[in-house]
């Protein structure tokens, strides 16, 4: 369960892939599209508001113990819009919604490297936001060896 309804912190950052392609958001036909693209040298990067939430993780052992805490994030590139996991379509979409946000908008934050993060679907453990054909998609990671695969690694930058 997520501890409290307010985030423990918020962080405004640009999001890029492991290979330094930018994640951009464009309004098209009254809905937002998400792109993975190379930006021109001085082109401004889109920013995303990451809201960090604490989530208690139930103990694997018997009883009601709590084994540890996880960090969940929501990602909002513009007011009232959040990234959502569409597990049926294996897609990542931007949806307009009100708080409290649905579980599909929450992602468990992983650090696979000191300067890279990954986003695991709260609603579908083992499924991560990744890059496929210059778009964001949901990618199933079936073993810990594949957790470091480049297409699920992202960089956060304040600039």
């Amino acid at each position: 369960s997520i501890t409290g309804i307010s985030p423990i912190t918020e962080y405004l950052a640009s999001l890029s892939t492991y290979n330094d392609q930018s994640i951009t958001f464009a309004l098209e036909d009254e809905s937002y599209e998400i792109y993975v693209e190379d930006l021109k040298k001085d082109e401004k990067k889109d920013k995303v508001l990451l809201s960090y939430y604490e989530s208690q993780h139930p103990s694997n052992e018997s009883g009601d113990g709590v084994d540890g805490k996880m960090l969940m994030v929501t990602l909002s590139p513009t007011k009232d819009f959040w990234l959502h996991a569409n597990n049926k379509e294996h897609s990542v979409e931007l949806h307009k919604c009100e708080k409290p946000l649905p579980d599909q908008a929450f992602f468990v934050l992983h650090n696979m490297h000191s300067n890279c993060v990954s986003f695991e679907c709260k609603t579908d453990p083992g499924v991560f936001i990744g890059v496929k054909d210059n778009h964001l998609a949901l990618i199933k990671v079936d073993s810990s060896e594949n957790l470091c695969t480049e297409n699920i690694l992202f960089k956060l930058s304040e600039t």
């Epitope: 423990i8 912190t9 962080y11 950052a13 960090y52 604490e54 993780h57 694997n60 084994d67 540890g68 805490k69 996880m70 960090l71 468990v108 934050l109 992983h110 650090n111 696979m112 490297h113 000191s114 300067n115 993060v117 810990s144 957790l147 470091c148 304040e158």
Partner: antibody, heavy 122, light 107 residues
Framework: EVQLVESGGGLVQPGGSLRLSCAAS????????MTWIRQAPGKGLEWIAS????????YYPDSVKGRFTISRDDAKSSLYLQMNSLRAEDTAVYYC???????????????WGQGTLVTVSS | DIQMTQSPSSLSASVGDRVTITCLAS??????LAWYQQKPGKSPKLLIY???RLQDGVPSRFSGSGSGTDFTLTISSLQPEDFATYFC?????????FGGGTKVEIK
């Protein structure tokens, strides 16, 4: 209850080697980044090495890079620090620490071992 | 590397005093800033993380604030058990770095 117990410290000559161990219990070891931090006598804290929860990434400051190696054995819930080419300035209490959250580095170090003293002297 | 400059390096205070310790970073970063308390011969104890979040079990007289480059630890009413050394630590960028410490002594 989370417990971290270091061992392996002692007196070693300059240029020598030592292997520190940290036995972890009370939590799911393989879900956490683990870190070694040291403190020279009467001095401040210095980060020495970190390892990702998967074991796939290791990180060091320049002061120990190439001399120290952090590793983990998830089956034994143990963390290690192999220290080679030891110098007098490596003399310190070495602490094993655990990250605050599953899977990532955010939020400081809520759990520390009692520390093990490494003395490098001839 | 991000340098963390802590001030003052030491201070004398009385029980009941309000105490403020500051940590200045050489460059701005997200708020992955922690504060620790250490007593002689003991391991450090996490007090505050995420710049302002109180670690479980830590008395509410401790509080943290700040963002960017300036961070503050405040003890609202100093208690006898609070006489110790305090360290800040940034976790945003590797190498992880600590402040030099602030020793809080009895006046």
């Amino acid at each position: 209850e989370v417990q971290l117990v270091e061992s392996g410290g002692g007196l070693v000559q300059p240029g020598g080697s030592l292997r520190l161990s940290c036995a972890a219990s009370g939590f799911t070891f393989n879900n956490y980044w683990m870190t070694w931090i040291r403190q020279a006598p009467g001095k401040g804290l210095e980060w020495i090495a970190s390892i990702t929860y998967t074991g796939g990434g290791t990180y060091y400051p320049d002061s120990v890079k190439g001399r120290f190696t952090i590793s983990r054995d998830d089956a034994k819930s143990s963390l290690y620090l192999q220290m080679n080419s030891l110098r007098a300035e490596d003399t310190a209490v070495y602490y094993c620490t655990r990250a605050n959250y599953y899977y990532n580095t955010y939020g400081g170090f809520p759990y520390w071992g009692q520390g093990t003293l490494v003395t490098v002297s001839s | 590397d991000i340098q963390m400059t802590q001030s003052p390096s030491s201070l004398s205070a009385s029980v009941g005093d309000r105490v403020t310790i500051t940590c200045l970073a050489s460059e701005g970063f997200s708020n992955d800033l922690a504060w620790y308390q250490q007593k002689p011969g003991k391991s450090p104890k996490l007090l505050i993380y995420a710049a302002s979040r109180l670690q479980d079990g830590v008395p509410s007289r401790f509080s943290g604030s700040g963002s960017g480059t300036d961070f503050t630890l405040t003890i609202s009413s100093l208690q006898p058990e609070d006489f110790a050394t305090y360290f800040c630590q940034q976790g945003s960028k590797y190498p992880l770095t600590f402040g030099g410490g602030t020793k809080v002594e009895i006046k």
